[in-house]
């Protein structure tokens, strides 16, 4: 015997209280597949979340984050605070990158500057809190007579100690 509920399309539910007839999903609920015995409550995008796509009778609402925050997790399940370039997010809020580290994005952690000498190269441009160092050619790559400009050692910035 065929289940009468299998005829209920998406956007409806099989109403046991009404002889298993297909009833439309109530407001603020949806069913994305046929044959459902209940409709699911629509996701509410409020506070740190904002609505990217409204809920319909056949699909859930989709959220993104209010400006100043960015999405984390599948389907934007969480919103995380943005920081400025040159900072990283800690439980104490946004903190400047420590000396010798950088972050060129509004999210993520501060990463150590590239160690040019590991590749046998010299520092062409000093690093900052926002930018990695730029490595230049190795001394051996410089043609004889070419002027090699050695940049001054970077002045120590008042970096924060690690969290």
């Amino acid at each position: 015997l065929q289940d009468p509920c299998s005829n209920c399309p998406a956007g409806t539910f099989c109403d046991n209280n009404r002889n298993q007839i297909c009833s439309p999903c109530p407001p603020n609920s949806f069913s994305s597949a046929g044959g459902q015995r209940t409709c699911d409550i629509c996701r509410q995008c409020k506070g740190v979340f904002r609505t990217r796509k409204e809920c319909s009778s056949t699909s859930n609402a989709e959220c993104d984050c209010t400006p100043g925050f960015h999405c984390l997790g599948a389907g934007c399940s969480m919103c995380e605070q943005d920081c400025k370039q040159g900072q990283e997010l800690t439980k104490k809020g946004c903190k400047d990158c420590c000396f010798g580290t950088f972050n060129d994005q509004k999210r993520g952690i501060c990463r150590p500057w590239t160690n040019c000498s590991l590749d046998g190269k010299s520092v062409l441009v000093n690093g900052t809190k926002e930018r990695d160092v730029v490595c230049g050619p190795s001394p051996a790559d410089l043609s004889p007579g070419a002027s090699s400009v050695t940049p001054p050692a970077p002045a120590r910035e008042p970096g924060h100690s690690p969290q």
Partner: nanobody, 123 residues
Framework: QVQLVESGGGLVKPGGSLRLSCAAT?????NYWMNWVRQAPGKGLEW???????????YYVDSVKGRFTISRDNAKNSLYLQMSSLRAEDTAVYFC????????????????SGQGTTVTVSS
């Protein structure tokens, strides 16, 4: 259903005080870091303060340090923000928000927040 409901906002004169409350339902508050964030008119969302599960750790954005105090009463499933020496620039909608699973370890993401309560500081 997991829900946060803020209350306590209103109109206050510069230098005045307000206490915001946030009632949590549908989950056990004591299992989570909790936060206050705010959105000033025409601006993006700004993190204000957070507090760990037992209240032993509390952190604030620089602009409110010494003026705002975050606290919690886990027995009442409630979060609070005591605001004093209020300034015009504190005018905003204030939201309480729950730190998601793994907050402070893997991420600082917020997974539930309320509708907000409006604080207006004006003479």
């Amino acid at each position: 259903q997991v829900q946060l409901v803020e209350s306590g906002g209103g109109l206050v004169k510069p230098g005045g005080s307000l206490r915001l409350s946030c009632a949590a339902t549908g989950f056990t508050l004591s299992n989570y870091w909790m936060n206050w964030v705010r959105q000033a008119p025409g601006k993006g969302l700004e993190w204000v303060a957070n507090i760990n599960q037992d209240g032993s750790e509390r952190y604030y954005v620089d602009s409110v340090k010494g003026r705002f105090t975050i606290s919690r009463d886990n027995a009442k499933n409630s979060l609070y923000l005591q605001m004093s020496s209020l300034r015009a620039e504190d005018t905003a909608v204030y939201f309480c928000a729950r730190g998601g699973e793994g907050y402070g370890v893997d991420h600082y993401g917020l997974d539930v927040s309320g509708q907000g309560t409006t604080v207006t500081v004006s003479s």
